[in-house]
């Protein structure tokens, strides 16, 4: 008889995670008598996957009925494949021996690669908000995919971004890989409704990429603009002054009126008007009893937005014998000290 040969017909097999992998092996002879074993890897550190003679291998089933006298097919199927199962598998024929069987011949090996889907991309934005014209960074992470080849793209409102840096780890061979990408986005005033999307394409996704999103509303702060005006008089001894707070985001806003530097009233913005671009407007008014003032009054509208340093705008209300209805306004960025009268 010709000497027994161990034939592993496939050099490589690729299987999706969760599926079963069939590893084929055939002998050309029944002689010499002895069991076959399957190993992952070679050398002293090889891992026993299946032993025809003894042991319990719950994930392994034999393709043929190995106890048939004339069986020459020693293919196995491994169920519920994970990336950790990747490696080169060897079908090894042992020759009966006493007390122990002796390794007789090995197949050439079959490399099992596992196709594992990337996890859903997680996009995270900056820890603190930034104002328009500033650049913020968004990160995108996905894990557990194999093989290593992967494509990542960034979009802002459907437009592809180019300012990003991507790393796939580890650099060498691994059972699975992770991707990390950082994109730099320049904020604009209209970005409250904007969205950034991280899109990942991989062989396991069959042309249907995974997407992770982040809303720029979580990253942007649009500071308010202030306008203080005097409204027509309701009565001869009263002046109605309004503070229009416009185009701010997010909502959190506290307004304080000062008369000649002294706090008159503090209120928190409640009923806001939302603009089309997602920013908000709010108006506050102050009724001034002109009889209580001999001199001109400087009215200051001071706004603290989103925990930032206060901004203010002042208005000089003239007190005259004839209760004239005119004045001029003064703007102060974070001016907490009383405004000098005009």
């Amino acid at each position: 008889e010709d000497e027994l040969q161990v034939i592993q017909p496939e050099k490589s097999v690729s299987v999706a995670a969760g599926e079963s992998a069939t590893l084929r092996c055939a002998m050309t002879s029944l002689i010499p008598v002895g069991p076959i074993m399957w190993f992952r890897g070679a050398g002293a550190g090889r891992e026993l996957i299946y032993n025809q003679k003894e042991g319990h291998f719950p994930r392994v089933t034999t393709v043929s009925e190995l106890t048939k006298r004339n069986n020459l097919d020693f293919s196995i199927s491994i169920s519920n494949i994970t990336p950790a199962d990747a490696g080169t598998y060897y079908c090894v024929k042992f020759r009966k021996g006493s007390p122990d069987d002796v390794e007789f011949k090995s197949g050439a090996g079959t490399e099992l690669s596992v196709r594992a889907k990337p996890s859903a991309p997680v996009v995270s934005g900056p820890a603190v908000r930034a104002t328009p014209e500033h650049t913020v960074s968004f990160t995108c992470e996905s894990h557990g995919f194999s093989p290593r080849d992967i494509t990542l793209k960034w979009f802002k409102n459907g437009n592809e971004l180019s300012d990003f840096q991507t790393n796939v780890d580890p650099a060498g061979d691994s059972v699975s890989y992770s991707i990390h990408s950082t994109a730099r986005v320049v904020l604009t005033r209209g970005d409250v409704h904007s969205q950034v999307i991280c899109e990942i394409a991989h062989i396991t996704l069959q042309g249907d990429p995974l997407r992770g999103t982040a809303n720029l509303s979580e990253a942007i702060r649009v500071p308010p603009t202030l306008e203080v005006t005097q409204q027509p008089m309701r009565a001869e001894n009263q002046a109605n002054v309004t503070c229009q707070v416009s185009n701010f985001y997010p909502r959190g806003l506290q307004l304080t009126w000062l008369e000649n530097g002294n706090v008159s009233r503090t209120e928190t913005a409640s009923t806001l008007i939302e603009n089309k671009d997602g920013t908000y407007n709010w108006m506050s008014w102050l009724l001034v009893n002109t009889c209580a003032h001999r001199d001109d009054v400087v009215l200051t509208c001071q706004v603290e937005h989103d925990g930032q340093q206060a901004v203010s705008k002042s208005y000089a209300l003239e007190i005259s014998a004839h209760q004239k209805e005119h004045g001029s306004d003064i703007t102060h960025e974070a001016a907490l000290a009383p405004t000098a009268p005009l």
Epitope: E1, L30, P32, G34, I36, K53, K68, R69, K96
Partner: antibody
Framework: QVQLQQWGAGLLKPSETLSLTCAVY????????WNWIRQPPGKGLEWIGE???????NYNPSLKSRVIISVDTSKNQFSLKLSSVTAADTAVYYC??????????????????WGQGTTVTVSA | SYELTQSPSVSVSPGQTASITCSGD?????YAWWYQQKPGQSPVLVI????KRPSGIPERFSGSNSGNTATLTISGTQAMDEADYYC?????????FGGGTKLTVL
């Protein structure tokens, strides 16, 4: 351990069909091959063939054209039919079990338990 | 077809060691079985897979198999060991028996 009890016609005329049955008691029917062996008077043992629970058979090439071995798992029995017998088929016929169990592989199991034997005579 | 050859007879004195041989091409690459048959009785398996003894078989029975020869050894042979002994191996899913050896205990 498995026990085997066999029966069948002991006297046949040439060209008739020999028919023997072997009943299996004890053991797991699905972990055995079931054999038939014969021994002509004053001679050595000759293997006829075997069958397992799923009906997989192997036959001695010299007898293959005349032999049918079948199995009835519902009764835990297996049978031998040898057609067109001649005087040369006169022998003691034995059934025997080959237990293969979980640690077995091809050609690692032999005939561990034998039936009591049935003498078959072919004579005109 | 594969053939196994046994010497027709072996004689041994009680208490002595009897060696019964079985030869076949590269028999050591196969498993050998040994069966004992006493007159008027069914064969009994005494050695399986070259050198293993079934339960109930006395320790004086032992086996070996290498090269082209399998050997059944009976140490301290007793009168009750007088019988025909058959070796058996498998070839291409066919059981092959040796011609048998008659052991006579003098």
């Amino acid at each position: 351990q498995v026990q085997l009890q066999q029966w069948g016609a002991g006297l046949l005329k040439p060209s008739e069909t020999l028919s023997l049955t072997c009943a299996v008691y004890g053991g797991s029917f699905s972990t055995y091959y079931w054999n038939w062996i014969r021994q002509p008077p004053g001679k050595g043992l000759e293997w006829i063939g075997e069958i397992n629970h799923s009906g997989s058979t192997n036959y001695n090439p010299s007898l293959k054209s005349r032999v049918i071995i079948s199995v009835d798992t519902s009764k835990n029995q297996f049978s031998l039919k040898l057609s067109s017998v001649t005087a040369a088929d006169t022998a003691v016929y034995y059934c025997a079990s080959s237990h293969y169990g979980s640690g077995s592989f091809p050609d690692s199991y032999g005939m561990d338990v034998w039936g009591q034997g049935t003498t078959v005579t072919v004579s005109a | 077809s594969y053939e196994l050859t046994q010497s027709p007879s072996v004689s041994v004195s009680p208490g002595q060691t009897a060696s019964i041989t079985c030869s076949g091409d590269k028999l050591g690459d196969r498993y050998a079985w040994w069966y004992q048959q006493k007159p008027g009785q069914s064969p009994v398996l005494v050695i399986y897979q070259d050198d293993k003894r079934p339960s109930g078989i006395p320790e004086r029975f032992s086996g070996s198999n290498s090269g082209n020869t399998a050997t059944l050894t009976i140490s301290g042979t007793q009168a009750m060991d007088e019988a025909d002994y058959y070796c058996q191996a498998w070839d291409s899913s066919t059981a092959v028996f040796g011609g048998g050896t008659k052991l006579t205990v003098l």
